[in-house]
Interface confidence: low
């Protein structure tokens, strides 16, 4: 059943409906383990609802690909912003050092 159990699988049923990438807040995949012998995919929607997805479904496999692509793009964007910030800091530092020299 649809409930988290300590030391057990989380999902008894899987969601039948289509879940769109836009409505996803998070997507977690759990590999088989001693406490649960099957792959579990748990989606957290933007409205806070958590639901179990069918790992064998073609739609779900496609959703996972899109989600992973989106996550990696966001990481790249974050890294890009960090890189830009570092450049700005370097520029500011060099400007300060020039100012010090001129005074």
């Amino acid at each position: 059943t649809p409930v988290v159990r300590k030391g057990r699988c989380s999902c008894i049923s899987t969601n039948q409906g289509t879940i769109h990438l836009q409505s996803l807040k998070d997507l977690k995949q759990f590999a088989p383990s001693p406490s649960c012998e099957k792959i579990e995919i748990i989606a957290t929607l933007k409205n806070g609802v958590q639901t179990c997805l069918n790992p064998d479904s073609a739609d779900v496999k496609e959703l996972i690909k899109k989600w992973e692509k989106q996550v990696s793009q966001k990481k790249k964007q974050k890294n890009g912003k960090k890189h830009q910030k570092k450049k700005v800091l370097k520029v500011r530092k060099s400007q300060r050092s020039r100012q010090k020299k001129t005074t």
Epitope: P2, V3, C11, S13, N54
Partner: antibody
Framework: QVQLVESGGGVVQPGRSLRLSCAAS????????MHWVRQAPGKGLEWVAV????????GYADSVKGRFTISRDNSKNTLYLQMNSLRAEDTAVYYC?????????????????WGQGTTVTVSS | EIVLTQSPGTLSLSPGERATLSCRAS???????LAWYQQKPGQAPRLLIY???SRATGIPDRFSGSGSGTDFTLTISRLEPEDFAVYYC??????????FGPGTKVDIK
């Protein structure tokens, strides 16, 4: 339409075995957890067993643990209940029921589809 | 193991009256895990309420559920002739274990 049809009930002697079947139609059987629930004559409902959508998890009531086995064949859209070492107190109408749609992992959606039941009588 | 107690055992009312059915748990139950069913003679049970207060598909709004912790209530605001039946509460617990209450019979006065 969504339907569950039980079969396999009958009169059986104490200590003998019986296998119940539940044929599902009108929905994607492999996406749903399934239950067996029974009702002794003139009594209330008693939950018997549950099986996850893929058969990985099974749960049993203490009264049947070690004697009954729940299983499913998703290729045949069929749920089973193997009943061994039957006792007089196992006499009941046995219903199969579908786990409620939704499968939110922090929520129990009840049993939303039920069969009409099959009668098991254990008597010498 | 959680034990559910339902009261009263029998409720005798007339059509149009309000019915209040109680379900008490021996220990605290998450409201997310409580359901109510209706059963008429010779028929399979029918899901009415899940998550303590959410109506199942096709259930009229005269049926409502409430409660939390150990005390839950099913209310039928105005009894219709077809509402005279036995009502069961049910809880889901880990392991997984599902427990039904003993039922409340609502009959015609």
């Amino acid at each position: 339409q969504v339907q569950l049809v039980e079969s396999g009930g009958g009169v059986v002697q104490p200590g003998r075995s019986l296998r119940l079947s539940c044929a599902a139609s009108g929905f994607t059987f492999s996406d749903y957890g399934m239950h067996w629930v029974r009702q002794a004559p003139g009594k209330g409902l008693e939950w018997v067993a549950v099986i996850s959508h893929n058969g990985a998890i099974k749960g049993y009531a203490d009264s049947v643990k070690g004697r009954f086995t729940i299983s499913r064949d998703n290729s045949k859209n069929t749920l089973y209940l193997q009943m061994n070492s039957l006792r007089a107190e196992d006499t009941a109408v046995y219903y199969c029921a579908r786990e409620g749609d939704g499968s939110n992992i922090y929520y129990y959606y009840g049993m939303d589809v039920w069969g009409q039941g099959t009668t098991v009588t254990v008597s010498s | 193991e959680i034990v559910l107690t339902q009261s009263p055992g029998t409720l005798s009312l007339s059509p149009g009256e309000r019915a209040t059915l109680s379900c008490r748990a021996s220990q605290s139950v998450s409201s997310s895990y409580l359901a109510w069913y209706q059963q008429k003679p010779g028929q399979a049970p029918r899901l009415l309420i899940y998550g303590a207060s959410s109506r199942a598909t096709g259930i009229p709004d005269r049926f409502s559920g409430s409660g939390s912790g150990t005390d839950f209530t099913l209310t039928i605001s105005r009894l219709e002739p077809e509402d005279f039946a036995v009502y069961y509460c049910q809880q889901y617990g880990s392991s997984p274990i599902f427990t039904f209450g003993p039922g409340t019979k609502v009959d015609i006065k």
